[in-house]
Amino acid sequence: LVLDFNNIKSSADVQGAGKGSLCASDRDCSEGKFCLAFHDERSFCATCRRVRRRCQRSAVCCPGTVCVNDVCTAVEDTRPVMDRNTDGQDGAYAEGTTKWPAEENRPQGKPSTKKSQSSKGQEGESCLRTSDCGPGLCCARHFWTKICKPVLREGQVCSRRGHKDTAQAPEIFQRCDCGPGLTCRSQVTSNRQHSRLRVCQRI
């Protein structure tokens, strides 16, 4: 019963333009916009796509970025997207969580390219690795893709048992690890017994 996908690119950041922004080509649009055509509807000027967003041509990407392997890429960071490591988070996990900030698996010789916070993935957007996500988020698997999810806060369940898993693929829903200053520990009940449920607690 499990849907299991892989998705390595991020959501486009496009909004419909207001009236008066119809276009026939990219040249008809102001700087920072491109002409977006739909199958059955008129074309309009749409906001350019930031780093890591999908593209079919460089005109779609914001100034300072180009379209490389279907992804808007900073001019100084144009290595192929398929060459990028994915933090080794595609296997099975004992606790179904993903490390925060999970940078330790980056291979040698491939330094992280620092991106501006505005280009970082938001909650629910797809990602390659945690460094693609904004502050307080990690890159974790959900169904068929890896998306930016919030790191766990104090009191939140951090054990895999907190989510209904299936026999076919118990690890398709990854959680982030506990946030900074927190650790995943068994909850102590009122009668001092340790419950099976593990939650994020202050270190």
Partner: antibody, heavy 120, light 111 residues
Amino acid sequence: EVQLVESGGGLVQPGGSLRLSCAASGFTFSSYAISWVRQAPGKGLEWVASVSGTGLGFQTYYPDSVKGRFTISRDNAKNSLYLQMNSLRAEDTAVYYCATSLENYAFDYWGQGTTVTVSS
Amino acid sequence: EIVLTQSPATLSLSPGERATLSCRASESVDDFGISFINWYQQKPGQAPRLLIYAGSKQGSGIPARFSGSGSGTDFTLTISSLEPEDFAVYYCQQLKEVPPTFGGGTKVEIK
């Protein structure tokens, strides 16, 4: 431009077999998961099968309603997705769409569909 | 499995009016701080088109008049001012748990 084009639909008798194809272009096919979703005449949408992309090992998944009867597969060299449908039933009559997730985790690109009719 | 119930089944409105479509889940579709609900538009003879994902985020190239809201079990798709091309069937979908499921749809028709 991302394009998904389905083919292979047609009329088949109950118990028969049919193989659907989906030709993809405009994106790096092997990197992405791709699915089949169907829609019976006048009805809603139903997920049928999925195969993950290279990063998750091309794993395949099915709902109970088609498990054991349908097989999803992909030929990355040909940028093609397939759905082998065996032991077809009247309730499998539907428009079959292939759909993929390129920009977020939902189905954000769809083909136009191919019609499968199971009738005697 | 999670059952999604959409209401109303049919909504009769005029261009320029505001459309409010509801999707109710049989159990919460929130997890990891995210609402795993998506909205699709389908016109006759066409494939569905993604409008909203993660409850409130717009899909690529979707006009700003489409917005999503809600959490837990109750979600709403709002079309702020109906354009002639917006008359179609709208489906919600949950992606919190397996199997992924769709609602039965709401038809927005011209009054």
